[in-house]
Interface confidence: low
């Protein structure tokens, strides 16, 4: 979370003299406060925008706009904050609005844009303007808040940013799954244009419940350039209990621009649906036990096992 | 312009501590992992320690394990390296360095003394 | 942990010689490694990344060549201001180990 580098931050309009400042998000309202205080803003638009940077870099920005109420208020307005707060982190930036000349009503209603807050793929955000001055601490809030969901690498917009080109946004491994003969499962996917190797994995559950009843890796060496674009195939023998069916096939690749935080393609395929008809096994082929954990290497990013941002289902 | 820039080195006494950091501009510092890199005098290059884009994987030198810790700020553009319980082999030239896409190390500050002695 | 080895140590040649710098790993690291190039008192620089793929801006008389545990650094024509002391580096996995380097300079 971070302002845009190198744009002239510019609020004026005709009929306005303003000024962007860098904020500290806290505004001195809330220590000297005012009696008469501005209305809140009528309603806020938060949408995706993708900006270059003077490093010519594709960053995906929010585009914020809100527009005022058209009450008397605005005679008392003075400026407004921005802030942006990324949830998981609790990471919070401000800017603030600072109004030169007051606001007169005129023939329609006033409408404020900011399209510098550089954001990351796959995080949401708050986005809260707040009128200036802030109310006296009983007063009526004058603020509106909305949160935004940035989408993924895996989304058009998204893919051609440097920070989702650099986790490896622009593969598609177009992955494929054939179950064979005698508990064996074959992946297939296609290798992107670097020398890098990529690794496989995958885990089996059973249908019934979410318990992960096999696990295991398997490394695919770098390719060699007359390999790139081409179908890479991994076949791994399956548990011999039946009852562990579902299988989720993880395939990560080790680009050089992202090493062990490259995204991550997935597929998952379920247990075969069994008939009516179907004699049941015995009993004790149900006991959950477990097999041995393999294949694992120092590849293995164990912190981001589980965590959905760097799997991409399709 | 890319650049990186490190400070916090310095002279410190056998089992000190020292706190490097590495400022970095002109690139989405967020979307790149980074190592750091010694010299000592007269002597060739040593890895010391890595750390990805989001601080999930982290790499050290067998060297340095155990003493040195390596860190991130990516709100603040920092790379860091805590080094503990340092010893006279730690006396070096320590780089801040930003791995290629493709492969390598593209981008390396000028490097800051550190100077271990009693 | 695979070892990086370099040879020579170091070597000294006339302006205009053939300049051949060899590296080789204890182990297989397929095209995972980078050269670098010191001058005296400076920061290294990448020259050749992925084996063989010249860093831009990095003048054409060095090449790189090899896969696996050998590789090789050549200056098809030395120049003065080719002294320095080159590195190799795997960057395959962890450690990220570097060679001992090669010192160069000219007769």
């Known amino acids: 979370l971070r302002l845009l580098d190198h744009r002239a931050l510019v609020c004026s309009q005709p009929g306005l003299n303003c000024t962007v400042k860098n904020s500290t998000c806290l505004d001195d309202s809330w220590i000297h406060p005012r009696n008469l205080t501005p209305s809140s803003p009528k309603n806020i638009y938060i949408n995706l925008s993708v900006s270059s940077t003077q490093h010519g870099e594709l960053v995906p920005v929010l585009h914020v706009e809100w527009t005022l109420q058209t009450d008397a208020s605005i005679l008392y307005l003075e400026g407004a904050e921005l802030s942006v707060l990324q949830l998981n982190t609790n990471e919070r930036l401000c800017v603030r609005f600072e109004f030169l000349s007051k606001l007169r009503h005129h023939h329609r209603r006033w409408r404020f844009t900011f399209s510098h807050f550089v954001v990351d793929p796959d995080q949401e955000y708050e986005v809260t303007v707040h009128h200036l001055p802030k109310p006296i601490p009983d007063g009526d809030p004058n603020h509106q808040s909305k949160n935004f969901l940035v989408p993924d690498c895996e989304h058009a917009r998204m893919k051609v940013t440097t920070p989702c080109m650099s986790s490896g946004s622009l593969w598609d491994p177009n992955i494929t799954v054939e179950t064979l003969e005698a508990h064996q499962l074959r992946v297939s996917f296609t290798l992107w244009n670097e020398s890098t190797p990529y690794q496989v994995l995958l885990e089996s559950f059973s249908d019934s419940e979410n318990h992960s009843c096999f696990d295991v890796v398997k490394q695919i060496f770098a390719p060699r350039q007359e390999e790139f674009h081409q179908r890479a195939n991994v076949t791994f023998t399956l548990s011999k209990f039946h009852w562990c069916c579902h299988h989720h096939v993880q395939v990560q690749p080790f680009f050089s621009s992202c090493l062990n935080d490259c995204l991550r393609h997935a597929v998952t395929v379920p247990c075969p649906v069994i008939s009516n008809t179907t004699v049941p096994k015995p009993v004790a082929d149900y006991i959950p036990l477990w097999e041995p954990r393999s294949g694992s290497s120092d590849y293995k990013d164990d912190d981001d096992k589980g965590s959905s941002h760097h799997h991409h289902h399709h | 312009e890319v650049q990186l820039v490190e400070s916090g080195g310095g002279l410190v006494q056998p089992g000190g501590s020292l706190r490097l950091s590495c400022a970095a501009s002109?690139?989405?510092?967020?979307?790149?992992?980074m190592n750091w890199v010694r010299q000592a005098p007269g002597k060739g290059l040593e890895w010391v320690s890595f750390i990805s884009a989001r601080s999930s994987t982290i790499y050290y030198a067998d060297s340095v394990k155990g003493r040195f810790t390596i860190s991130r700020d990516n709100a603040k553009n920092s790379l860091y390296l805590q080094m503990n319980s340092l010893r006279d082999e730690d006396t070096a030239v320590y780089y801040c360095a930003r791995p290629k896409v493709g492969g390598g190390m593209d981008v390396w500050g000028q490097g800051t003394t550190v100077t271990v002695s009693s | 942990d695979i070892q990086m080895t370099q040879s020579p140590s170091s070597l000294s040649a006339s302006v205009g010689d053939r300049v051949t710098i060899t590296c080789r790993a204890s182990?297989?690291?397929?095209?995972?490694l980078a050269w670098y190039q010191q001058k005296p008192g400076k920061f290294p620089e990448l020259l050749i990344y992925?084996?063989?793929t010249l860093q831009s801006g990095v003048p054409s008389r060095f090449s790189g060549s090899g896969s696996g545990t050998d590789f090789t650094l050549t200056i098809s024509s030395l120049q003065p201001e080719d002294v320095a002391t080159y590195y190799c580096q795997k960057y395959n996995r962890a450690p990220f180990t570097f060679g001992p380097g090669t010192k160069v300079d000219i007769k």
């Open positions: 992925a084996a063989s």
């Open positions: 002109g690139f989405t510092f967020s979307s790149y992992s």
């Open positions: 182990q297989g690291i397929s095209n995972y």
